[in-house]
Interface confidence: low
Amino acid sequence: APRGTQAEESPFVGNPGNITGARGLTGTLRCQLQVQGEPPEVHWLRDGQILELADSTQTQVPLGEDEQDDWIVVSQLRITSLQLSDTGQYQCLVFLGHQTFVSQPGYVGLEGLPYFLEEPEDRTVAANTPFNLSCQAQGPPEPVDLLWLQDAVPLATAPGHGPQRSLHVPGLNKTSSFSCEAHNAKGVTTSRTATITVLPQQPRNLHLVSRQPTELEVAWTPGLSGIYPLTHCTLQAVLSDDGMGIQAGEPDPPEEPLTSQASVPPHQLRLGSLHPHTPYHIRVACTSSQGPSSWTHWLPVETPEGVPLGPPENISATRNGSQAFVHWQEPRAPLQGTLLGYRLAYQGQDTPEVLMDIGLRQEVTLELQGDGSVSNLTVCVAAYTAAGDGPWSLPVPLEAWRPGQAQPVHQLVKEPSTPAFSWPWW
């Protein structure tokens, strides 16, 4: 047996063998050397590179009682769960004195059923909408041919004849399963089965049908939903008067929106209980038994102004000769918009009514015709917005002003009945 450290003498008495197997195999490579004196550390090389983190064990057995006698050194490299990255040429390496010795090589090869690098994934798609699926497999042995299956039915007549790494699906009208088979000389491996769930298409043309001060009616056009009828549509709305706003298409509004559900058909929903003259943002999604569509973009909408819901308050009207002094306060009831002004009407018992636009003032001096002998003069006041006049106050009689007496104030004890409408609760 070779001994010593002469350049021409290799200390190796056993070289690594060969391993060929399928992925996941566990195997061991072994090399043995006989040296004189202190045993060296055995290193392992793969394709000429030292394996720094090799799972190796080294056993040393002295052949004599003296340290300078010969030693048998055995190193074993364990390969657990064989992968493609483990394949290559393996050698043992030792440093003896000033010389380096390398064993004869052994080879690790991989050969078995195809191995999937990429498999089709579950996903949701809108009805009748194109999409792609991916599948990729490798040997060795090569070549590896793929065969796609839809609902367990092959899409090509033979492996390798149809689509390979990417399958283009022009659209589905029902939820379907897809898988791919990988074929090589060793046999067939089947990928996971991906479920492609068909959801309704995003609704289109979300728009306002009608606007009332406290109510908006919206409608939309549903998208295709395949063989699955729509069960309902969901409308989300958010108050957008906080200055932040929502840009069309932004993913999230400034506050979490809340939700109303609409039976379908009709693809229409009345949103009640809104604020007059207030901006909102709305979006809609429609749902089938398979799940919901994607949301439409946020649509900005705004309720129109309404008329004031009550008359001006605390109207007082006094008369001094040919002049009448009338003043009042803003209505306490909701204005439902921007107050533009007040209208005043006065009328005597036998004289026609006179109508005046006072603007935003809350008092007026009236110049009465004649000598002031008109009897039973009464005054009414109404507030108005861009939407029109609110209710008129009850008629207030003009009272004669006497020196030293405070102007009488007529409290309104009764208001005209409020029209029925949805109140803005939020």
Partner: antibody
Framework: EVQLVESGGGLVQPGGSLRLSCAAS????????IHWVRQAPGKGLEWVAG????????YYADSVKGRFTISADTSKNTAYLQMNSLRAEDTAVYYC????????????WGQGTLV | DIQMTQSPSSLSASVGDRVTITCRAS??????VAWYQQKPGKAPKLLIY???FLYSGVPSRFSGSGSGTDFTLTISSLQPEDFATYYC?????????FGQGTKVEIK
């Protein structure tokens, strides 16, 4: 953490006045309405008054209209219920509750204060 | 005013039972209805809003349905902590109104 804390309840003679406060933390009044709901001993819930997040509107149950006034100080994040001309039938635990925008529910309530 | 009429006013049930409480509005209130649970000495808790939407953190055994005038709260499998009084409430029109309550007691 969202919290509502009522205070100001107590014993009062018929015809007297009380002012209840509802201090809010964990959210801003700017997009949230506040409502007062009461519950007489052994009875159900009765809505009293509400103030929405925008506008100057205030709303009242017919039974308290003209006697109670709801208001809010956004700088203090506090709502108030001023109760005048109190009657024996106003005896109840008064709760304030938060009203989220565009929903039909009160999602956070205070612990209540007894009047 | 819109009246909300709840039925029954009380019921006895056992743990695991399916319980249904109904609420009828005197006029159409769309889906502007909420359901609350209240235990003695405590503030009400929101369970369902907008007729059918489960409020965050509420167990999925609670569900709501209905629109227009007829609404239902269902507890699919009654648990010991569910014995309480339940109220419906409409917010479609002023004044806001509650049902008279349904007390769920242990049989």
């Amino acid at each position: 953490e969202v919290q509502l804390v009522e205070s100001g309840g107590g014993l009062v003679q018929p015809g007297g006045s009380l002012r209840l406060s509802c201090a809010a933390s964990g959210f801003s009044f700017t997009s949230i309405g506040i409502h007062w709901v009461r519950q007489a001993p052994g009875k159900g819930l009765e809505w009293v008054a509400g103030i929405p997040p925008v506008g100057r509107y205030t709303y009242y149950a017919d039974s308290v209209k003209g006697r109670f006034t709801i208001s809010a100080d956004t700088s203090k994040n506090t709502a108030y219920l001023q109760m005048n001309s109190l009657r024996a039938e106003d005896t109840a635990v008064y709760y304030c509750a938060r009203w989220r925008s565009l929903s039909s529910g009160m999602d956070y309530w205070g612990q209540g204060t007894l009047v | 005013d819109i009246q909300m009429t709840q039925s029954p006013s009380s019921l006895s049930a056992s743990v695991g039972d399916r319980v249904t409480i109904t609420c009828r509005a005197s006029q159409d209130v769309s889906t502007a209805v909420a359901w609350y649970q209240q235990k003695p000495g405590k503030a009400p808790k929101l369970l369902i809003y907008s007729a059918s939407f489960l409020y965050s953190g509420v167990p999925s055994r609670f569900s709501g349905s209905g629109s227009g005038t007829d609404f239902t709260l269902t507890i699919s499998s009654l648990q010991p902590e569910d014995f309480a009084t339940y109220y419906c409430q409409q917010s479609y029109m002023s004044p806001l109104t509650f049902g008279q309550g349904t007390k769920v007691e242990i049989k």
